[in-house]
Interface confidence: medium
């Protein structure tokens, strides 16, 4: 088993809005939950927009999820990680 | 389950600070979500604010964002809520409680402690 | 913000009796996600409150079935089979789907 490293960037989006991304790579299985979590509950699947999970060409895997949230209203939004029994959690940056 | 053991009552002066603790064991810390809430003597609850003891983010109730401030102590497991500009309003029982998103995806003060009493008098 | 109202105010019951609790939300509390985020809590005198429902209908670990949840949109209900001594106190409900999160009122259930 190769645990995902992740890593969570920002963008603009339209006015008063911001896109959140959300990136795995280098993990091994294949499988992977990775969501976007807002006061701990994760979002519904037609607010986030998900990468393919695909190889990087080392043997291991990558993908992403991203979403669109108020700007302001980024501590309130953290990316969830599970993968191989492990989970983790990953803030929005400010 | 778990534990969440509150500090004791407070008699303090308006106008000056308080810092109340949670201090928890038998969970993971760093994965849970801790809120604190607000009961006057026979009165509802008011939802304060959350902190998520894994990044320290948090999540204030409007009506409270200038009267408290969350933190946590990861090392000793404990969250804290320091309340300051005390007035005689402010005068009530305070709780800690964790989420349980993991286990019922979706319960929001599932483990309570057992309150801390804030008496606010000249 | 989101107003919680419970009815009644206090509810007078006879052990054994079925007990029924309202609670109406000024606006309808679907999250974003789907979920609808409502739960009841009980507090005993002197005690913190127990979470005995989540998700409008589910019991939380250790509820006795006697207790159960419905509802949708703006309009919940608890209802208690039978009602037990250990059943009293006052109960409350919450919303958990628009910050800030809100409890309504409260309704004493008491015996009669």
């Known amino acids: 088993t190769v645990p995902p490293m992740v890593n969570v960037t920002r963008s603009e989006a339209s006015e008063g809005n911001i896109t959140v991304t959300c990136r795995a790579s280098s993990f091994y299985p294949r499988n992977i939950i990775l969501t976007w979590r807002q006061d701990g509950v994760s979002l519904s699947h037609d607010t986030q927009q998900w990468g393919d999970v695909l190889p990087d060409g080392n043997g291991t895997y990558q993908t992403w999820v991203a979403t669109r949230i108020c700007a302001g209203e980024e501590q309130r939004f953290t990316c969830y990680m599970e993968h191989s029994g492990n989970h983790s959690t990953h803030p929005v940056p400010s | 389950q778990g534990q969440m053991q509150q500090s004791g009552a407070e008699l303090v002066k308006p106008g000056a600070s308080v810092k109340l603790s949670c201090k928890t064991s038998g969970f993971t810390f760093s994965d849970n979500y801790i809120s604190w809430l607000k009961q006057k003597p026979g009165q509802s609850l008011e939802w304060i604010a959350w902190i998520y003891a894994g990044t320290g983010g948090t999540s204030y109730n409007q009506k409270f964002t200038a009267k408290a401030q969350l933190t946590v102590d990861t090392s000793s497991s404990t969250a804290y809520m320091q309340f300051s500009s005390l007035t005689t309003e402010d005068s009530a029982i305070y709780y800690c409680?964790?989420?349980?998103?993991?286990?019922?995806?979706?319960?929001?003060?599932?483990?309570w402690g057992q309150g801390t009493l804030v008496t606010v008098s000249a | 913000d989101v107003l919680m109202t419970q009815t009644p105010l206090s509810l007078p019951v006879s052990l054994g009796d079925q007990a029924s609790l309202s609670c109406r939300s000024s606006?309808?509390?679907?999250?974003?996600?789907?979920?609808?985020?409502l739960e009841w809590y009980l507090q005993k005198p002197g005690q913190s409150p127990k979470l005995l429902i989540y998700k409008v209908s589910n019991r939380f670990s250790g509820v006795p079935d006697r207790f159960s949840g419905s509802g949708s949109g703006t309009d919940f209900t608890l209802k208690i089979s039978r009602v037990e001594a250990e059943d009293l106190g006052v109960y409350y409900c919450?919303?958990?789907?628009?910050?800030?999160?809100?409890f309504g009122g409260g309704t004493k259930v008491e015996i009669k």
């Open positions: 409680a964790r989420h349980d998103y993991y286990g019922t995806s979706g319960a929001w003060f599932a483990y």
């Open positions: 919450f919303q958990g789907s628009h910050v800030p999160w809100t």
């Open positions: 606006q309808n509390i679907v999250h974003i996600n789907g979920n609808t985020y």
